[in-house]
Interface confidence: low
């Protein structure tokens, strides 16, 4: 059998092969982080010859090369230095406007090894124009210096560049132009993980939160896919499975594809997904037509079921068939539901395609688009009606003019974009939805980045501490309450010298609010059981604090989700007649639950909830407690049904300074309360002055080490009677 | 409550510079929201706005085409006040001049929400 | 350069309403104001951005601009109306008044 010569190795770099020696099989080189290999790939012929795209000669020496960003070609009103041909990686260029020109972007901007320049474009504005002068990216030249209402200005890149965004851009009659920024990026260039996470989650992060009917002021949330209440998403997701994209890559389409399904689920919005493949043909595996696509469970079930030899006989790249697909389906719903009526123009659009490469028969994608955009009436007051993002995946044959043409083009947005590979695009799936942006007080949102900070990870934990030292933790329940423990308020009734900490974007130490009022229960009283023995007693260990003002709500900032209340039936997606009962079924409903709570030093650490057979065994070890409860004869006098129990195996236990704080799970992305610290049988940050010091309890210790967390669920009639007229309670 | 409070001589030599003084309360002349005019009103012309003064990180000056070769504006943080500097005038630049806060056109704010008291300037001799 | 253009004078009875027009090429395209100066007095921000009303100008100031027309109307005109109104819009570095309009309350 005919194969390919193995000669080529590239210096500096590695190389991995499709389908072996044999023919049809793809040769892609990779290089170290910087540089990029020249060429990017051979494909092995039948002729048993290797052929390298766009190559004269058949078989060029593979190198790396450095990667460079491209140099201004001019900078209007100011100056710039260096003045370089291009730049090496790491290398700056700074910008400087002359007198009466205001700088508008990035003053100093840095070569990445993308081969793309960090910050934002440098613009010398000086307002005078009708539209802002939208500023000559590197790289590009532009035509055009009126800002007027109607002026148009062009851009063009120069050589060997190629441009994404809009090469002619007009300026609107509300003063903003058309289209979105043209960049001019090296051929080999692609996207971070980290640009574009939050570069395409922008768009589906106001939405998210858009609908959230339990708001109670309406909030503008600004622009991006925004849904009206009433209004209703449908996405459709695209997944090439043509022959030059693995299996191991289809895999990895379908994991990105199920981890945004799984996300966008979990807000309350009114959503279809549509999900087709494609590779010669498209094969649609659900439609928005079918009532299935809003349930979460038959679309991932939908997208498990695709097969990547669904496409085995048909191995091109047929992307106009898959668009037109779209279009068909949006075609037979407006049928459906009247052309004319609100329930189809209310629907917002957004279409997001996961390709390797460009389309390579059925003619031209645009075509197909521009059909979707004629359906939907898409002009400059409906343009909020349709989101298309194009991702290509992988630096091979990404043909980023394609990529630009297709991905929509908006102010201030991108649409379009090219991943390094598929380990990247999971990357992005995973950061897009960290909705913690969102301006109202959606529950139970936190920022679950690699890059996020602990607050931005929780949110809505709090400090509650007198003016000396920090006592206690809370959570943020609405944008006005926090719940805590009772017993850190045993001490003395002057609340006016107490203050509640919470997160503040624009503070690495918080806000500091007042208390408006502090409401213990009645029922807490520590010494209730001395007579029994019993030194200690938190039964009823609850309290609530209203803040002197609203907390504005933030990244830093927002409320966790209790069970119990319609907002957490919301996020998750329960059914409208949902109990209580439902949700304790829901949340603790194993005999071990994996939970968290937040340490002092911000971090969130992980418990087990002992439930059933399991919470006797746990909570029993406290008869082994001689000194707290000397004559104990009976555990439950101390540990009663009111508490959660943890602390066994692997569990971390929280210390002194920790109760109050949130006991918490994660369900649907969104984070629900169950429980607050109250006390336990070990302290592990006795002793120690750092916060970030924590000892574990020796193996041998008697008692062994346990906590005790008051159970929301069984402080119900409580919890109502104070935030009756704050949260929407289900029945019980 | 922002108040501008203009001072300067009422009549003018022709060929002589003009110089008014706007004095600012309620406000700072190097807020980064707001601009600094100065405009003038004659029976012939209308209200005609003369030039503006700005801080953006650094100050920033513009002036109307007919009068941008004999004209300056300046700012005085110390005084929180800006002053205008009209050189060689004629019977021409008789009127009425008014200082007045306004913001950027680029931020939906074109506009003066408010203005000095005026102060008549004649030019003769 | 830009030029707006106003009828010089308009009439008008205690409790009619008055419109005053300000013209000029795709005006709606750009934020138009209104200034009422009486005389003797400085002007006064009756309406900006095309329709919004400076807090403490009573609620009979309305304004609208479509086309290459601003309009300022004043519903329910009395007395102390009487004045001069300028309308004034923002053009490729500078701000443009209107030629002024004398609105007379009979």
């Known amino acids: 059998a005919t194969s390919c010569p193995q000669n080529v190795n590239i210096s500096g770099g590695t190389f991995t092969l499709s389908h072996g020696w044999a023919p049809g099989s793809l040769l892609i080189y990779s290089c170290p982080q910087g540089l990029y290999p020249s060429p990017a790939s051979r494909l092995c012929k039948s002729s048993g010859q290797w052929q390298t795209p766009r190559a004269t000669r058949s078989l060029t020496k593979a190198v790396c090369k450095p990667v460079r960003c491209p140099a201004p070609v001019s900078f209007e009103n100011g100056i710039y230095t260096p003045r370089l041909g291009s730049y090496p990686v790491g290398g700056n260029v700074s910008f400087e406007c002359e007198d009466g020109f205001i700088l508008r972007g990035s003053p100093v901007r840095q070569c990445r090894p993308n081969g793309m320049w960090d910050g934002e474009t440098a613009v010398c504005d000086n307002g005078a124009g009708h539209c802002p002068n939208p500023g000559i990216s590197l790289g590009a030249v532009r035509t055009g210096s009126r800002f007027g209402h109607g002026d148009k200005v062009r851009y063009r890149c120069s050589s060997n560049l190629v441009l994404t965004g809009s090469a002619e851009r007009e300026c609107q009659g509300n003063g903003v132009w058309s289209g979105t920024e043209p960049i001019c990026r090296q051929p080999y260039s692609y996207d971070f993980p980290e640009d574009v996470a939050p570069a395409l989650g922008t768009s589906f992060s106001h939405m998210l939160g858009a609908t959230n009917p339990t708001q109670r002021t309406k909030e503008s949330l600004g622009r991006k896919i925004q849904i009206q209440r009433s209004g209703h998403l449908n996405l459709y997701l695209l997944l090439d499975s043509s022959q030059s994209v693995s299996e191991n890559d289809f895999l990895i389409f379908k994991e990105s594809a199920s981890l945004m399904v799984d996300r966008i689920f979990s807000f309350e919005i009114n959503v279809s997904v549509a999900i087709i493949t494609f590779a010669s043909e498209p094969k649609v595996l659900m439609s928005v037509l079918n009532v299935n696509s809003r349930d979460i469970t038959e679309v991932i079930s939908s997208l498990e079921n695709a097969k990547y030899k669904d496409h085995e006989n048909g191995t091109g790249t047929n992307t106009y068939a898959a668009l037109n697909s779209v279009y068909l389906m949006m075609n037979n719903q407006m049928q459906l539901l009247g052309m004319k009526t609100m329930a189809w123009q209310e629907i917002r659009h957004a279409i997001i395609l996961l390709t390797d490469g460009k389309s390579n028969m059925g003619g031209s994608p645009k075509t197909a688009v521009d059909q979707i955009r004629e359906i939907l009436n898409i002009n400059q007051k409906r343009n909020d009606y349709l989101d298309i993002y194009a991702i290509g995946v992988g630096k091979l044959d990404v043909d980023w003019r394609e990529l630009n043409e297709l991905g929509s083009k908006k102010d201030g947005e991108r649409h379009a974009f090219i991943l390094q590979d598929t380990k990247a695009l999971h990357q992005v799936f995973e950061h897009m939805l960290d909705v913690s942006k969102l301006t109202d007080t959606i529950c139970g949102v936190g920022n679950m980045s690699a890059n996020a900070s602990d607050q931005e990870r929780t949110p809505w934990h709090v400090t509650i501490k007198p003016k000396s030292q920090e006592t206690c933790r809370g959570a943020l329940i609405s944008d006005q309450w926090v719940l805590t423990a009772a017993h850190c308020f045993r001490d003395g009734n002057d609340h006016s010298l107490w203050r509640v900490n919470v997160g503040d974007p624009k503070s690495q130490w918080g806000k500091e609010f007042l208390i408006e009022k502090a409401v213990i229960s009645p029922g807490f009283d520590v010494f209730a059981k001395k007579n029994q023995g019993i030194l200690e007693f938190y039964g009823d260990d609850i309290a609530l604090l209203k803040l002197a003002q609203k907390v504005k709500m933030s990244t830093h900032a927002r409320p966790i989700c209790l069970p119990c209340t319609m907002e957490a039936n919301l996020a998750l997606r329960r059914p409208q007649g949902s109990t209580c009962r439902d949700h304790e079924n829901e949340l603790l409903n194993k005999q071990s639950v994996p939970a968290h709570f937040v340490a002092l030093n911000g971090s969130k650490l992980n418990i087990n909830l002992k439930m059933g057979v399991e919470w006797t065994s746990c909570a029993e070890v406290v008869s082994q407690e001689k000194t707290m409860f000397p004559n104990l004869t009976d555990v439950r006098e101390v540990v009663t049904d009111q508490f959660l129990c943890s602390g066994t195996q692997e569990d971390e236990s929280p210390c002194k300074g920790e109760s109050g704080g949130a006991v918490f799970l994660e369900r649907r992305f969104r984070f629900f309360q169950v429980g607050l610290v109250s006390w336990g049988l070990y302290n592990p940050c006795l002793g120690s002055a750092d916060k970030n010091s924590r000892k574990r309890a020796p193996r041998s210790k008697v008692p062994p080490p346990r906590d005790f967390h008051i159970n929301l669920f069984r402080m119900q009639p409580w919890l109502r009677q104070h935030l009756g007229d704050v949260l929407n309670f289900l029945p019980l | 409550q922002v108040q501008l409070q203009q001072s300067g001589p009422g009549l003018v030599k022709p060929s002589q510079p003009l110089s008014l003084t706007c004095a600012i309360s309620g406000d700072s002349v190097s807020s980064n929201s707001a601009t600094w005019s100065w405009i003038r009103q004659s029976p012939s012309r209308g209200l005609e706005w003369l030039g503006r003064?700005?801080?953006?990180?650094?100050?920033?000056?513009d002036y109307a085409v007919f009068v941008k070769s004999r004209m300056t504006i300046n700012p005085d943080t110390s005084k929180n006040q800006f002053s205008l500097q009209l050189n060689s005038v004629t019977p021409e630049d008789t009127a009425v001049y008014y200082c007045?806060?306004?913001?950027?056109?680029?931020?939906?704010?074109?506009?003066?929400?408010?203005w000095g008291q005026g102060i008549l300037v004649t030019v003769s001799s | 350069s830009y030029e707006l253009t106003q009828p010089p004078s308009l009439s008008v009875s205690p409790g009619q309403t008055a419109s005053i027009t300000c013209s000029g090429h795709?005006?709606?395209?750009?934020?138009a104001c209104w200034y009422q100066q009486k005389p003797g007095q400085s002007p006064v921000l009756v309406i900006y951005?095309?329709?919004k009303r400076p807090s403490g100008i009573p609620e009979r100031f309305s304004g609208s601009n479509s086309g290459n027309t601003a309009t300022l109307t004043i519903s329910g005109t009395q007395a102390l109306d009487e004045a001069d109104y300028y309308c004034q819009a923002w053009d490729s570095i500078t701000y443009v008044f209107g030629t002024g309009t004398k609105v007379t309350v009979l």
């Open positions: 951005q095309d329709n």
């Open positions: 795709k005006l709606g395209d750009k934020y």
């Open positions: 003064t700005y801080y953006r990180s650094k100050w920033y000056h």
């Open positions: 007045a806060r306004g913001g950027m056109p680029a931020s939906d704010i074109p506009h003066f929400d408010n």
